[in-house]
Interface confidence: low
Amino acid sequence: KIDACKRGDVTVKPSHVILLGSTVNITCSLKPRQGCFHYSRRNKLILYKFDRRINFHHGHSLNSQVTGLPLGTTLFVCKLACINSDEIQICGAEIFVGVAPEQPQNLSCIQKGEQGTVACTWERGRDTHLYTEYTLQLSGPKNLTWQKQCKDIYCDYLDFGINLTPESPESNFTAKVTAVNSLGSSSSLPSTFTFLDIVRPLPPWDIRIKFQKASVSRCTLYWRDEGLVLLNRLRYRPSNSRLWNMVNVTKAKGRHDLLDLKPFTEYEFQISSKLHLYKGSWSDWSESLRAQTPEEEPTGMLDVWYMKRHIDYSRQQISLFWKNLSVSEARGKILHYQVTLQELTGGKAMTQNITGHTSWTTVIPRTGNWAVAVSAANSKGSSLPTRINIMNLCEAGLLAPRQVSANSEGMDNILVTWQPPRKDPSAVQEYVVEWRELHPGGDTQVPLNWLRSRPYNVSALISENIKSYICYEIRVYALSGDQGGCSSILGNSKHKAPLSGPHINAITEEKGSILISWNSIPVQEQMGCLLHYRIYWKERDSNSQPQLCEIPYRVSQNSHPINSLQPRVTYVLWMTALTAAGESSHGNEREFCLQGKAN
């Protein structure tokens, strides 16, 4: 052997392998004529624990009692130090500190699949820190025994490599595991089982789904199983759900009809198998099958709203809007919307298919009674049409909701409240709250939003398509039969002072007064709903405070007269805008001198 102890020996008593907490005596002794060259009294024997010096002695031998050694392996090396020379290694010893094995617990055996092999697992208990051998023994009928040994450092699993067969499924087998090391041994309690107890079937494979006549109500799941499988459990869920539907079936023979699937929904399916009603264990779940169920014709009805706009004495523009059906109502991909417009007295009707939009605009005569019907179509059919009679939604003044207010309610929400109309409130069938971004000039391309509210409600929280620092025109409609009344208000969810003031674009003189015209502040700089404009003026070279005139904000207004200027005096004029949060900075300054006569 390499590095044999030529110069001396290290002995360890009582043993190289000791129980945790034990004491050992280590002796280092020199062989004859292996000491220092001149004088043996100069021999200095030094004992190292790994690289640390723990003891020394002058002479031919050294004794050391060592306690408190940690679990695991500790290396002791004895060296000789002579005067004027390096230390020389004499010999060494390893001491192994550990514990006897605990009784292995929870021994359990399994055979994966009818063609698999028997493998057992157990809990070792605490680490022994010593070389520990595990022996697994299996005994069966007719005095058959199998044995397997395991020498891995963390051994808690062994495969016998034998296959139990179903010829005698009730035959008993007994397994036992024994752990042995230098400090002791321990055996598990025996585990007794039959073929049916330990065979865990392979998960089902080759899973398929069929929809008879492309109908979700006629759906069959197919799969393949090992031959002895008696029970299956199926689980399935929409791909976007975390909750499984579970079905247990007996003697399914690789097929099962599913009756409660939703149309046009991607599902995930998994299957597990078992050999016996109350013996053995379920297989792992199969790999997932993902499949989309077929479409069915839409259910539910579209939520439709409309806007009327006067064009001239004989024509009006009708804009129809509708909301997408929910996924559960659409039950498929909506291919188009069918809009039918009909004049009720004359019977004239026109139908149009709309693709890719949820709105439609047309021009109709101002005379006659008009109605629309809108439905949604997928590959299997159409939803029931929503019918609406076109009326003047704000005609009935007595139906107008009263005391409408709009207040910010948290981030990007506006709470709209109102009082019922003066006319018999019980006549109201529903309220509709409508909102759209306020654009000077009443741009009809601005998206329209609405929600419906029960007749007993007097408030609604609007949150859809609400942005901070944008002003919304909000209308509340009360509908009763073929009549409607409305009230409107401006509102925002969040506001601050406008970023700029109005830009004065012209000042003109008219009969001793002036007319100031301005450009609206760009919407993105208004920072909420404008409440007022202010026009300031002062004499050009004066240090006096400016005079001001405050004008309530009206959407369409962009000019205002001022008649308090002195003739032949040059004035500087500018404007600001105000929201509830404060006043903007100045807009541009303009100079003007009134030419009229002095009083």
Partner: nanobody, 123 residues
Amino acid sequence: QVQLEESGGGLVQAGGSLRLSCAASGRTFSSYVVGWFRQAPGKEREFVGRISWSGARTYYADSVEGRFTISRDNAKNTVYLQMNSLKPEDTAVYYCAADLKWEVLLSEHYEYWGQGTQVTVSS
């Protein structure tokens, strides 16, 4: 019967790193504990560290603890000694050794040995 062959030695500056490999022939190599040893000129062979069969447990000499790491890849029948923060006193011939009994540190207990690979650390 197991044959061992070390590789990866060479010249490196103080503070640098090297990775030594110990390749084994023989199908049952995964059952063996493997130890690394080194021998500097004029000195005794000293224990560096060792790794159990599965790689689950390692021991190191105090002088290399925290700087050297031993690992193994049983699929490739190879054990590695990763040496970081090298010092001039780490200069030596490095040997790997293998044995079936896992509680061994001293070189005389190892049955199979490689030929060694030279590692030189310059200051």
